[in-house]
Amino acid sequence: MGSRLEEELRRRLTEIEELARFAVDEHNKKENALLEFVRVVKAKEQSSVPHWWWTTMYYLTLEAKDGGKKKLYEAKVWVKRDPNMIFKINFKELQEFKPVGDA
């Protein structure tokens, strides 16, 4: 069992993966699907200027299993951070999720 500090370090180090897993979970809920997250293939972030530390749009290309078959998906996740604690995500929203082909 990790300490509270170790859990926080892990959270900060794997943020992109967390967001990708969130995207798959949200898609599964919305579409009543059963995709299983595999890995992040590519990630790009676009931040709002001037408040780039507050809101960020993540463009993720991820691999997920659909009925045992690996496929590629593109997800767009909008993230809002706490302006007083910029490493804390206050709110996240899946804005787009679409298949892009077989992995």
């Epitope: 990790g2 300490s3 509270r4 500090l5 170790e6 926080e8 370090l9 604690m85 490493f87």
Partner: nanobody
């Protein structure tokens, strides 16, 4: 109040190596040893992200993109943390910040060094 002083940045070619070091002051060894120490980096126009850290238990943890290339080590008796960066890539170019994370029970508190520039260019 924890103060952090970094050293060791510079200009290097792709595939090269650099070693960053950081020493903490203004805090007792026992207090610091209850905190995590590590490194963040910030590329131009991007958010500051954690790269590697050593927990208060001595466990080293890494961001996926640097795993196998970077090695973080912590000297608990001398209040130091180092980052050995090997097989550097252009995308590793950033200002690297020494970082200490304290668990204050109700929240986490971050302490920062002033930053050291690492530039990877052909």
């Amino acid at each position: 109040e924890v103060q952090l002083q970094e050293s060791g940045g510079g200009l290097v070619q792709p595939g090269g190596s650099l070693r960053l070091s950081c020493t903490a002051s203004g805090v007792t060894i026992s207090a610091l040893n209850a905190m995590a120490m590590g490194w963040y980096r910030q590329a131009p126009g991007e958010r500051r992200v954690m790269v590697a850290a050593v927990s208060e238990r001595g466990n080293a943890m890494y961001r996926e993109s640097v795993q196998g290339r970077f090695t973080v080590t912590r000297d608990f008796t001398n209040k130091m943390v180092s980052l050995q960066m090997d097989n550097l890539k252009p995308e590793d170019t950033a200002v690297y910040y020494c970082h200490v994370l304290e668990d204050r029970v109700d929240s986490f508190h971050d302490y920062w060094g002033q930053g050291t520039q690492v530039t990877v260019v052909q």
